[in-house]
């Protein structure tokens, strides 16, 4: 806390300008009116205040707005935003996307800080859902944002917002998250033709069920190995050799290099060796000829 001392004669600040950088902490506290600071917040970013001086300015705003800052002040916080704690930010009511953008700009190019995470959480909760414009903004600043959400949070993403998602936005998503996002993407892109549809849906396929993969195999999509390796193992296992061959097209040759890795390894173990041999890739580990395959999961379901 800064002690309350009278402002020296002639030092009362009439505006927020560079002369204030020469003020000591106690002079800033005594000579800068909090209401003046609030109305001229946009000037702070152009002034090289010290960290200590920023603490004083923050303290003045905290005194003026003990219940939380108004959005008109929040929008112009600039780098003073980085002096805010998550507790401070939880008091705010940020509704404007412009305010969100202005504050994200302050931390642009850096990892998501606790302040930014809290701000985004407040903003999204205030909106009730993650609409397209918000998602556009968040993924522009933080490509990994979508994958930082829980499956429960992702369930509030409307299918229309999926149009804003770029492939790199899904790079760090795990299967549980893709399970939620895939049906939304399928719905969002349903009116597109075959090749265009595949281009859009491709990065979401880690959440696709077997029947959708079977359907894709009939459309000459030529899925690359990188996409195939991200598919759910349980969705790949029921695919026949012919279906995988059609799904991958010319990329089928890449299976050999991946035969020891999931899901390829597990899929090979489920195929007849005869069928695998038809690919001419030298894939080994299939079911030998003459062996009967019992589907135990089916048997358990029946009993």
């Amino acid at each position: 806390e800064v002690e309350k001392t009278a402002c020296p004669s002639g030092k009362k600040a009439r505006e927020i300008d560079e002369s204030l950088i020469f003020y000591k902490k106690w002079e800033l506290e005594a000579c800068v009116d909090a209401a003046l600071l609030a109305t001229q917040m946009d000037r702070v970013n152009a002034i090289p205040f010290t960290y200590e001086q920023l603490d004083v300015l923050k303290h003045k705003l905290d005194e003026l707005y003990p219940q939380g800052y108004p959005e008109s002040v929040i929008q112009h916080l600039g780098y003073l935003f980085l002096k805010m704690s998550p507790e401070d930010i939880r008091k705010w009511n940020v509704t404007s996307l412009e305010t969100l953008k202005a504050l994200l700009e302050v931390n642009k190019g850096h990892e998501m800080s606790p302040q930014v995470a809290t701000l985004i959480d407040r903003f999204v909760k205030g909106r009730g859902q993650l609409d397209k414009d918000t998602l556009d903004t968040l993924t522009a600043f933080y490509p990994g944002y979508l994958c930082s959400l829980s499956p429960e949070e992702l369930s509030s993403v409307p299918p229309s917002s999926i149009w804003a998602v770029r492939p790199q936005d899904l790079d760090t998503c795990d299967p549980r998250q893709l399970d939620v996002l895939y049906p939304k993407a399928r719905l969002a892109f349903q009116n597109m033709n075959g090749s265009e549809y595949f281009v859009k849906i491709q990065s979401f396929l880690g959440g696709a069920p077997t029947e959708d993969l079977k359907a894709l195999s009939q459309q000459n999509v030529s899925m690359d190995l990188a996409t195939f390796m991200k598919l759910r193992t349980d969705a790949v296992l029921p695919l026949t050799v012919a279906e995988v061959q059609k799904l991958l097209g010319p990329h089928v040759e890449g299976l050999k290099a991946e035969e020891r890795h999931r899901p390829v390894r597990d899929w090979i173990l489920r195929q007849r060796q005869d069928d695998l041999d038809t690919l001419g890739l030298g894939l080994q580990g299939g079911i030998p000829n003459g062996y009967l395959v019992l589907d135990l999961s089916m048997q358990e379901a029946l009993s």
């Epitope: 002034i47 090289p48 010290t50 960290y51 920023l54 780098y79 980085l82 190019g109 850096h110």
Partner: antibody
Amino acid sequence: QVQLVESGGGVVQPGRSLRLSCAASGFTFSSDGMNWVRQAPGKGLEWVAVIWNDGSNKYYADSVKGRFTISRDNSKNTLYLQMNSLRAEDTAVYYCARDRGPLWPLDYWGQGTLVTVSS
Amino acid sequence: DIQMTQSPSTLSASVGDRVTITCRASQSISRWLAWYQQKPGKAPKLLIYKASSLESGVPSRFSGSGSGTEFTLTISNLQPDDFATFYCQQYQSYSRTFGQGTKVEIK
């Protein structure tokens, strides 16, 4: 007068860790931001990391993100750089330097400590 | 990150010469630019900050100018003590990137 003294450098194998320290005196350490800057032999200066006065904000160069951690102990007037998963290209003289605010230059520098990453 | 490009990389000059070094930023950094001097085996020393403000104790033969993306450091009357490497650095962004350096050597 302001003094910054780095220590903790030495020879280390690739993949290993090292912690550098910077002891500060002659100014109110808890009021100012602190940076690490490095210089590979015969090369230019490369900014590595900054930590704000109260430790609330830390920023890193892309080349060290996820491997290096900057921290400070204001009660001991000491700045640290924890370096993990070291690579040959991390070989450099490491300097600590002070800044007084987000829009301030690096006005005081230490003399540097040499880190050599080699097998 | 903001890229800083200095030119020339090396500059040969004589005592008494007027020397100019240029620094270019990949995006506008307003006037948040510093210049440092470094001698072999020594730590860098701050010469100029905020593009044109002279650091206390630095001789007035050093001057800086520019704003936005184009900046210059001028040494008006090169002295024997001035032969060194000079670096520009932006500090508008928290990633305070340096230029690659300009070595001023004796002609």
